[in-house]
Amino acid sequence: EDELQVIQPEKSVSVAAGESATLRCAMTSLIPVGPIMWFRGAGAGRELIYNQKEGHFPRVTTVSELTKRNNLDFSISISNITPADAGTYYCVKFRKGSPDDVEFKSGAGTELSVRAKPS
């Protein structure tokens, strides 16, 4: 069977401070059932960057409309980038669990580097 793949096509993205960064992610399947989230960093100390279902992420917008049916594009855009945003960002598929969802598969990561604002 073709198991779901998480595709982050860019290994790295470089953005000038103050601009927006687009981080691309696509899935090859709608299953297993469960949400997709974005994190910065890996392991226990990773930072949640975007979760559609809960939380408030004012600088993050989704590239595809949130009412799009059977969406396989989970790319995001982060506005007003600062040097503090530098790091490696992971798109992660979770498998629905009870009571908690379980991490199923992660993308390879996209390293965001921040250039100085052009003068």
């Epitope: 779901l4 709608l30 299953i31 059932v33 997709i36 559609q52 279902k53 949130l66 799009k68 059977n70």
Partner: antibody
């Protein structure tokens, strides 16, 4: 055109077993979750079970008695029903799940249903 | 388990009238509500998802609104083919997916 065709319903005694099938066509079956929803005579809709890849989910009322499965090579969804009870009497619908946004499922296509009657 | 309460249970309406159905959730379901129409002897048919998005091919006389716990399905001008039972369903928190008890629309 999406088509879902259920089969396997019938009359069975309490404690008996039945296996329902749902033949799917017109869409990429293997990448979608699929579900069974039932409707007792004259009653409302009740979700029974959903399958993703190998991830399965059940209503408490059928847990341990019903098993959902799929064969992607045959584009077919199954529901194995054991230890049937009178309260399982219903029309059983096969439904294709649709997602919206980044999670959340509803049912965008339904089969015509197959009637299961549990009676002695 | 999230309980969905639909009201009224039955509506008797004349063609051309505006019809409003209510669906109330026992807790916040954001906008994760779908609406279905079921005619006698037929399978349910998806009308609305994400509280207000019409499914492909659904006439624009059908509209949905609401978020949180209170949702409404409106038929702006009822046609004779709109008789049947209308169900709401939540998909915010599952299992289980839950449906409302339905509102039956009878043609006057």
């Amino acid at each position: 055109e999406v088509q879902l065709v259920e089969s396997g319903g019938g009359v069975v005694q309490p404690g008996g077993s039945l296996r329902l099938s749902c033949a799917a066509s017109g869409f990429s079956f293997s990448i979608y979750a699929m579900s069974w929803v039932r409707q007792a005579p004259g009653k409302g809709l009740e979700w029974v079970s959903t399958i993703g890849a190998d991830d399965t989910y059940y209503a408490d009322s059928v847990k341990g008695r019903f098993t959902i499965s799929r064969d992607n090579s045959k584009n077919t969804l199954y529901l194995q029903m054991n230890s049937l009870r009178a309260e399982d009497t219903a029309v059983y619908y096969c439904a294709k799940d649709s997602t919206v946004g980044w999670s959340g499922d509803f049912f965008d296509y339904w089969g015509q249903g197959t009637l299961v009657t549990v009676s002695s | 388990e999230i309980v969905l309460t639909q009201s009224p249970a039955t509506l008797s309406v004349s063609p051309g009238e505006r019809v409003t159905f209510s669906c109330r959730a026992s807790q916040n379901v954001r906008s994760d509500i779908a609406w279905y129409q079921q005619k006698p002897g037929q399978a349910p048919r998806l009308l609305i998802y994400a509280a207000s998005s019409r499914d492909t091919g659904i006439p624009d006389r059908f509209s949905g609104s609401g978020s949180g716990t209170d949702f409404t399905l409106t038929i702006s001008s009822l046609q004779s083919e709109d008789f049947g039972v209308y169900y709401c369903q939540q998909y915010y928190d599952w299992p289980p997916f839950t449906f409302g008890g339905g509102t039956k629309v009878e043609i006057k």
